[in-house]
């Protein structure tokens, strides 16, 4: 049986006050994606993208989170408290639930590079 793979942007860093794109990609499966959840390290749900209902950004993040690109999420006006783990959860049929992990480090330095590489967790 062929099951899919979640590829993520892995470990990324971004500058305080800047923005960053959190991106996951599900490949190698024909499963239908019914919903994608984005969850923060402290157990907060940031956003949900439902195949039928579209995007829902949770109120606590409405000012700083923008949907996309694609099924990804753009986190804006970064603070040091944004440092930590982020999880994308793909709910699919018939495979079930796929999960990917991204670690974001927010840096004080003005020379912080936004480095992103795709990796399989």
């Amino acid at each position: 049986m062929m099951t899919g793979t979640i590829e993520t942007t892995g470990n990324i860093s971004a500058k305080k006050g800047g923005s960053v794109i959190l991106q996951c990609h599900l490949s190698s499966t024909m499963a239908q994606v019914t919903q994608v959840n984005w969850e923060q390290h402290d157990h907060s749900l940031l956003a949900i993208r439902n195949a039928e209902l579209g995007w829902h950004i949770y109120p606590a993040f409405k000012d700083r989170v923008a949907p996309g690109p694609g099924l990804g999420l753009t986190l804006q006006s970064l603070t040091m408290n944004d440092t930590g783990e982020y999880f994308c959860t793909y709910h699919t049929y018939p495979d079930g639930t796929y999960r990917g992990r991204i670690f974001l480090e927010v840096l004080e330095s003005s020379v912080a590079e936004h480095s992103a590489r795709f990796q399989i967790p």
């Epitope: 959840n37 999880f87 959860t89 992990r101």
Partner: nanobody
């Protein structure tokens, strides 16, 4: 040490219902996967239903085609128990039913009934459906 204990099996007539319970000890529900599997005599073990539990306490269930619309998996965190409500039972549902769970925060994809490599397994409970 994580332990899973199934209960609720038994004998029932076709068309009847049973509710299986899987009580966990030493286990934390956070970003993990739990499921029910079954094995009939002389057959391979097959997935029945799984439930993914997020740290934000949302959950998502996935079912094998053979039980969709008849079986329901659910979780009661307060009771440390995962349930499998089985309605409209058929003789072909006769099997030993096993509960399975992943270690919390283990990233194993996907969480679905077609995935066999769970970290923890219970001893099973027998379900017999007669016609």
């Amino acid at each position: 040490e994580v332990q899973l204990a199934e209960s609720g099996g038994g004998s029932v007539q076709a068309g009847g219902s049973l509710r299986l319970s899987c009580t966990t000890s030493g286990y934390t529900y956070s970003r993990n996967c739990m499921g029910w599997f079954r094995q009939a005599p002389g057959k391979e073990r097959e997935g029945v239903a799984t439930i993914y539990v997020s740290a934000a306490s949302t959950s998502f269930a996935t079912y094998a085609d053979s039980v969709k619309g008849r079986f329901t998996i659910s979780l009661d965190k307060a009771k440390n128990t995962v349930y499998l409500q089985m309605n409209s039972l058929k003789p072909e549902d006769t099997a030993m039913y096993y509960c399975a769970a992943d270690p919390p925060d283990r990233i194993s994809n996907p969480c679905g009934p077609r995935r066999p490599d769970f970290g923890y397994w219970g001893q099973g409970t027998q379900v017999t459906v007669s016609s």
